[in-house]
């Protein structure tokens, strides 16, 4: 705190606020009877920038010239000091250095619609730190003339509150702005414009699409728009992409027909309007108009397959799987499936829609050629129909695909790798990988997933529906004409030892040697594909190691027998499944004692 | 923004004197500077006198000795006492204070009152 200057006076020319880099002069003088007591030459003042000492002076008055003060404010505070005495306060003064106003760049004005008002905008340049006032000025035919005063710090913006119409489009008008502070003044250089140069439309509204005979290829945009509007742009995109489409239209009168939309496809339309070929600017774009277009009949055609299941002598169950047409083929949205199926001798024909399904199930006699045709339906019409006959897909010998492999190919993926078969390998017309989760049981539930290659490939990555530490059956298929072979193997994405051994149920006894049956282990608990099963064994209190028989995993086996089991001793028995990646922990013990005499 | 009444002007005959006031309200607080300018028919607004809120001053030469600046930081009042006044300096005379605004300084200005030195 600085007491009011009761012993002296400070004065500060030219002025408390001064401009950057220029000197300013501090005096401070003594009020009379206000030094030290005695002698008015031992009076020493001191003059303080902040708490810094810059200058002293014995007698009644110092004068110091002060420069190279920072944007801001400075303190200075004056001092006097007596002999055996603390120094006094005298008085202080603030300066505050500040910077006259750049001259204001890039004047630009708008006026948003016809009946709009004038608003022009400009860069200040450097922070003056200094209010400064600005000046907006408006000059147009006749001598008319406007002015605009803001009187803000950050002033770059200001509205005329005038309407400039279109009654004589070409007359000039000019703009200028002018800024100043108590250090300067500045004007920017004049910005000269028409009506047509600076009235930006509105954006077009009331935007609406319309389909004649609810057709994508008989599309019309409409739009409403202000009176002057010459051009329109239009762009428009399906909703889930990025890029727009761009079109220019001269004369529109708020109409035009897009011929380029795809069927059943959600689009957001935006229109921007300007009034002349080269002045102006353009407006902002209009709110989106979201609209679907209209179904077309589906193209493209069904990816099917199937699988035949052996019932009994007389008959086969068939199950058909097909892929969903990808949204561009379908067109619309797919009320039903129709598939027909038909003896091809007899001529017999069978047809059923398929709504909520990819798939179909039926049984038919084992005799007789059979053949199927399958198709998607929307409200427009149907997809062309895909034919497959009916055959044995394995049972061309020569045509199976040899030394199939599945390797782990990163997370959920496996590589199939085969050679092609012995028969000439150029009668392959395709092949086609199909996979499923291994189930025990041999469930035919359990969904069917297929990709077709091409004749000269010999791998596929198969990545579909694959998931961590589950087993699939993978069957690679050679298909030639009316002819098929195949090889199959089991594949995992990744594997880890299962999570538990299998459960003995069972321990019999035959002709001196034993049967042992299991339950096989849940499949969750597999962890990848089954390689082997241990079965261990050893007798009854006994330290020894125990022995063991190593049986190769096959789907359906769950028991196998033991026959180097010594009569009437009590043996304990176990079991262990393995992966590649290890093998698991115990299963049950059982414990047996074979009552056939010794050999 | 702060508000500024000025009072005082008036007619006055050569080498009169007289006291101008000016009362600033509203959000007062951080006035670092209060000044008197003057502005004649014709001519630029000047700088007559100003005072800082630690009682510093500066004076227009054309005014030094014959006029006084003083301030009431409590009452935010600033008085500027005009002796041995002259035809010249007859004009509209305007207080002006500047406030802290951020780093910055921000200015209000009065209606201005008028003085006519009459010979």
């Known amino acids: 705190k600085i007491d009011a200057c009761k012993r002296g006076d400070v004065t500060v020319k030219p002025s408390h606020v001064i401009l950057l880099g220029s000197t300013v002069n501090i005096t401070c003088s003594l009020k009379p009877r206000q030094g030290c007591f005695h002698y008015s030459r031992r009076n020493k003042l001191i003059l303080y920038k902040f708490d810094r000492r810059i200058n002293f002076h014995h007698g009644h008055s110092l004068n110091s010239q002060v420069t190279g003060l920072p944007l801001g404010t400075t303190l200075f505070v004056c001092k006097l000091a007596c002999i055996n005495s603390d120094e006094i306060q005298i008085c202080g003064a603030e300066i505050f250095v500040g910077v006259a106003p750049e001259q204001p760049q890039n004047l630009s004005c708008i006026q948003k619609g016809e009946q709009g008002t004038v608003a022009c905008t400009w860069e200040r340049g450097r922070d003056t730190h200094l209010y400064t006032e600005y000046t907006l000025q408006l000059s147009g035919p006749k001598n008319l003339t406007w002015q605009k005063q803001c009187k803000d710090i950050y002033c770059d913006y200001l509205d005329f509150g005038i309407n400039l119409t279109p009654e004589s489009p070409e007359s000039n008008f000019t703009a200028k702005v002018t800024a100043v502070n108590s250090l300067g003044s500045s004007s920017s250089l004049p910005s000269t414009f028409t009506f047509l140069d600076i009235v930006r439309p509105l954006p077009p509204w009331d935007i609406r699409i319309k389909f004649q005979k609810a057709s994508v290829s008989r599309c019309t945009l409409y739009w409403r728009d202000e009176g002057l509007v010459l051009l329109n742009r239009l762009r428009y995109r399906p909703s889930n992409s990025r890029l727009w489409n761009m079109v220019n239209v001269t004369k529109a009168k708020g109409r035009h027909d897009l011929l380029d939309l795809k069927p059943f496809t959600e689009y957001e339309f935006q229109i921007s309007s300007k009034l002349h070929l080269y002045k102006g600017s353009w407006s902002d774009w209009s709110e989106s108009l979201r609209a679907q277009t209209p179904e077309e009949e589906p193209t493209g055609m069904l990816d099917v397959w199937y699988m035949k299941r052996h019932i009994d002598y007389s008959r086969q169950q068939i199950s058909l799987f097909w892929k969903n047409l990808s949204v561009s083929e379908a067109r619309g949205k797919i009320l039903h499936y129709q598939v027909t199926l038909q003896e091809l001798t007899g001529g017999k024909a069978m047809t059923q829609n398929i709504t909520g399904h990819t798939s179909w199930t039926t049984v038919i006699p084992r005799t007789g050629n059979w053949a199927v045709a399958v198709s998607a339906a929307n409200s427009k019409g149907s997809s062309l129909p895909t034919r497959i006959n009916i055959m044995n897909l394995c049972e061309a010998g020569l045509l199976a695909p040899r030394q199939v492999s599945a390797n782990s190919e990163g997370m959920d993926n496996i590589l199939v790798t085969w050679q092609p078969p012995r028969k000439d390998p150029s009668a392959v017309q395709e092949y086609v990988v199909e996979w499923r989760e291994l189930h025990p049981g041999g469930d035919t539930q359990v969904p069917l997933n297929w990709l077709r290659s091409r004749p000269y490939n010999v791998s596929a990555l198969i990545s579909e529906n694959i998931k961590s530490y589950i087993c699939y059956e993978i069957r690679v298929y050679a298909l030639s004409g009316d002819q098929g072979g195949c090889s199959s193997i089991l594949g995992n994405s990744k594997h880890k030892a299962p999570l538990s051994g299998p459960h003995i149920n069972a321990i019999t006894e035959e002709k001196g040697s034993i049967l042992i049956s299991w339950n096989s282990i849940p499949v969750q608990e597999q962890m990848g594909c089954l390689l082997h099963y241990r079965i261990y064994w050893k007798e009854r209190d006994s330290n020894s190691q125990p022995q063991l028989c190593e049986i190769p995993y096959r789907v359906s086996q769950n028991s196998h027998p033991i026959n180097s089991l010594q009569p009437r001793v009590t043996y304990v028995l176990w079991m262990t499944a393995l992966t590649a990646a290890g093998e698991s922990s115990h299963g049950n013990e059982r414990e047996f004692c074979l009552q056939g005499k010794a050999n | 923004q702060v508000q500024l009444q000025e009072s005082g002007g008036g007619l006055v005959q050569l080498g009169g004197s007289l006291t101008l006031s000016c009362a600033a309200s509203?959000?007062?607080?951080?006035?670092?500077?209060m000044s008197w300018y003057r502005q004649a028919p014709g001519k630029q607004r000047e700088l007559v006198a100003e005072?800082?809120?630690?009682?510093?001053?500066t004076y227009a030469d054309s005014v030094e000795g014959r006029f006084t600046i003083s301030r009431d930081n409590a009452k935010n009042i600033v008085d500027l006492q005009m002796n041995s006044l002259k035809p010249e300096d007859t004009a509209v005379y305007y207080c002006?204070?500047?406030?802290?605004?951020?780093?910055?300084?921000?200015?209000?200005w009065g209606r201005g009152t008028q003085v006519t030195v009459s010979s």
């Open positions: 509203g959000s007062a607080a951080l006035i670092f500077l």
């Open positions: 005072v800082s809120r630690y009682g510093s001053t």
């Open positions: 002006k204070a500047d406030q802290y605004y951020g780093d910055s300084l921000r200015s209000s």
